[in-house]
């Protein structure tokens, strides 16, 4: 579809006389008859095959023809056409003269043709107008043409559709030619596929509109290339979806079993030395002068009971101070102003005599302690037993009663019953107060995870399309990745193409 | 935001034991940062450090009280427990449960619940 | 264990003079861990001052603390009529933990 458009510039008939010889009276009102046919050899009589217009009377006698084009006027002329240009034409330019205001052409006297040319030839589409100026013997005319395309036609023959559009059946403008040209974003033979984010993974993201990266199910990030790791993982990571590989110093099913919590949390204080002692669990082991579970905190000087031979312990700004009882003197209470005389030994024990008399010292029965055998024996003020074990005085010695799990004189033996690797299968111990725990992999249970209980989902190979299988742990099923082009839960149809069912 | 909540008897018999229950609603008593401690307030008078425990279970206590007091966790219920046995009326006080910082300033305290031994 | 003794044990004041409460430890407080809180009837403690001097978040800037060693200050600078109640300090840095009395800040 195009439009041959006749642009009319000048028309001379300085006598102002018709084609008969006989002159216009009071002068030739001149007007244009335009006929446009098929290529002919001889341009004869017939159909306008192409079309046909007329024009209004442009002038009397000799006249330039404005163009008229911008104002909505009829210069150019206009011979729509509704085919592929042929590239050949002929034409026929008629002048009359119009004695009244009818122009049509029974209305018209015959003799009243002012001059007729007619030419034929090729004619390419295109924006350049071709002049040409045809000369008889008492006439002259002067014009240009050119076959332009129709609004959304394009080609060399004007037979090329093409309307622009941006919407969900195409986003593109026309080239010249007709061909596409797609927007920013846009690729594909039609423009309706966007150019996802730089980067996005080809597998395993996609996208809907330009610049974005939608992830497929298992894969996260900006370019959809980090892989979801399982549902609960907390110290671990993945190189295909869903697993969970330990980091360093962490354990169990969901890498959430602090195996070297010093390390991890630093949680001992004024340069006390820290041990690991199981699962989020560590012993700090003081500096002397500290105190607390994490040695966070200072010993009182009295702490450490300094004062000998029953002197009592007062904390002061600068340290401690000593207050001794009768008969004893001394920094700690250490020098004695008794002797044996004064029967000092109490409880039982018996004195003995030291440099010549000038000393005592007292030999306490069981049970007894002190310079004075002045104190009952508390084998557990020193509280020897570790990991909260419990410390008996049973008569002259003691013992620790220790908590599951723990064994020892002072219950500072950590049994672990994990030792001996008791899970099967991958699966992780915990060792309890009284006993152990196995945590299973998927597909094992029972107390040591010696029994199978299910099979790889993946295994019967249920993706289509060389999809990628994945099976998820927490229920047992699988999971198909679809490469491009394909969609369904096993990836078995293809995009764009609606499943056919046999209903 | 975290909140703390004694719970127990409010009569105990001379002699007997003292339990007390701290429940913690807002966060997690698993945090590895916090001291959960136990302070009394005796009538009319200042208080009294009583010890913490810590969420893997390792205690500290006043070395006055030492040997009566037990504290206790439960991390899958979100609570600690004090026990304190043979008490007298010498124990009668409201008691406060409360969290410490990694040093020990008490930031969160529960509401206090008064605690009598008396027969 | 280190006693903390607190003074005056009662100040009387108006709401808008100025308050200065004093702590004295019976030995040297380490690193400054020494805190102020306060008490109204029927309530537990709120944390005002750690570290003897920084301000806990939420407290008003009238309230501050100064001091280290063995002497230890907590000034309100402009007394608000919700600022009296019983005020308590606390030393963290040894074993046990302790409390001084209390000074009672009441309304004159």
């Known amino acids: 579809s195009g439009v041959f458009q006749l642009q009319l510039q000048e028309f001379i008939n300085e006598r102002g006389v018709l084609a008969s010889g006989r002159p216009c009276e009071p002068g030739c009102r001149t007007f244009f008859r335009v006929c446009l046919k098929h290529f002919q050899a001889v341009v004869s009589p017939g159909p306008c095959t192409f079309g046909t217009v007329s024009t209004p009377v442009l002038g009397t006698n000799s006249f330039a023809v404005r163009d008229d084009s911008s104002g909505g006027g009829r210069n150019p002329l206009q011979l729509p056409f509704n085919f592929t240009w042929p590239g050949t034409f002929s034409l026929i330019i008629e002048a009359w003269h119009a004695p009244g205001d009818d122009l049509r052409p029974e209305a018209l006297p015959p003799d009243a043709l002012i001059s007729k040319i007619a030419i034929q030839g090729s004619l390419a589409v295109g924006q350049n107008w071709l002049l040409d100026e045809q000369t008889s013997t008492l006439t002259r005319l002067r014009y240009s043409y050119r076959v332009i395309c129709s609004d959304n036609y394009y080609g060399d023959n004007c037979s090329r559709l093409c309307k622009k559009r941006n919407d969900h059946f195409g986003h593109y403008v026309c080239q010249p030619d007709g061909n596409l040209s797609c927007l920013p974003g846009w690729t594909g033979e039609y423009c309706q596929q966007p150019i996802c984010l730089s980067g996005c993974h080809e597998q395993n993201g996609y996208c809907s509109k330009p610049a974005e990266c939608l992830c497929r199910p298992g894969w996260q990030g900006r370019l959809c290339n980090e892989c979801i790791p399982h549902n609960g993982c907390r110290h671990g990571t993945c190189s295909t979806p869903w697993q969970c590989t330990c980091d360093e110093g962490w354990g169990g099913l969901f890498c959430d079993q602090d195996l070297n919590y010093c390390t991890h949390h630093s949680p001992c204080k004024n340069g006390a030395t820290c041990s690991n002692s199981g699962q989020r669990s560590y012993t700090c082991t003081c500096r002397p002068g500290y105190t607390g579970v994490d040695c966070e905190l200072e010993l009182s000087e009295c702490d450490s009971n300094p004062c000998r031979n029953g002197g009592s312990c007062k904390d002061q700004e600068d340290g401690y101070h000593c207050l001794c009882p009768p008969g004893y003197y001394g920094l700690h209470c250490e020098h004695s102003t008794l002797s044996c005389a004064d029967s000092p030994c109490f409880n039982g024990g018996s004195c003995r005599e030291r440099n010549q008399g000038a000393n005592y010292a007292c030999e306490c029965p069981p049970n007894f302690t002190g310079s004075n055998c002045e104190k009952k024996v508390d084998r557990c003020t020193s509280n020897p037993c570790a990991n909260g074990g419990q410390c008996l005085n049973r008569g002259p010695s003691r013992m620790c009663r220790c908590r599951p799990g723990f064994t020892g004189t002072y219950c500072e033996l950590h049994v672990s019953d994990c030792a001996r690797n008791p899970c099967a299968h991958g699966g992780t111990c915990h060792d309890l107060e009284n006993g152990l725990m196995c945590t299973c992999p998927a597909g094992f249970s029972g107390r040591r995870c010696e029994v199978r209980t299910s099979i790889d989902a993946c295994a019967s190979s249920p993706c289509f399309n060389r999809a990628t299988c994945y099976t998820d742990l927490s229920t047992d099923t699988f999971v198909c990745n679809c490469p491009y082009g394909f969609v369904g839960s096993r990836c078995e149809f293809p995009v764009g193409l609606p499943p056919s069912f046999p209903w | 935001q975290v909140q703390l909540q004694e719970s127990g008897p409010g009569l105990v018999k001379p002699s007997q034991t003292l339990s007390l229950t701290c429940t913690v609603s807002g966060g997690s008593i698993n945090s590895v940062t916090y001291y959960w401690t136990w302070i009394r307030q005796h009538p009319g008078r200042g208080l009294e450090w009583i010890g913490y425990?810590?969420?893997?279970?390792?205690?500290y206590y006043n070395p006055s009280l030492k040997g009566r007091v037990t504290i206790s966790v439960d991390t899958s219920k979100n609570q600690f427990s004090l026990k304190i046995n043979s008490v007298t009326a010498a124990d009668t006080a409201v008691f406060y449960c409360a969290r410490a910082s990694g040093s020990h300033t008490f930031d969160i305290w529960g509401q206090g619940t008064m605690v009598t031994v008396s027969s | 264990e280190t006693t903390l003794t607190q003074s005056p044990g009662t100040l009387s004041l108006s709401p808008g003079e100025r308050a200065t409460l004093s702590c004295r430890a019976s030995?040297?407080?380490?690193?400054?861990?020494l805190a102020w809180y306060q008490q109204k009837p029927g309530q537990a403690p709120r944390l005002l001052i750690s570290?003897?001097?920084s301000r806990v978040t939420g407290i008003p800037d009238r309230f501050s603390g100064s001091g280290s060693g063995t002497d230890f200050t907590l000034t309100i600078s402009r007394l608000e009529p919700e600022d009296f109640g019983m005020y308590y300090c606390q030393q963290y840095s040894r074993s046990p933990i302790t409390f001084g009395q209390g000074t009672k800040l009441e309304i004159k």
């Open positions: 570290g003897a001097s």
């Open positions: 030995q040297s407080v380490s690193n400054s861990y």
């Open positions: 425990i810590k969420f893997s279970g390792s205690t």
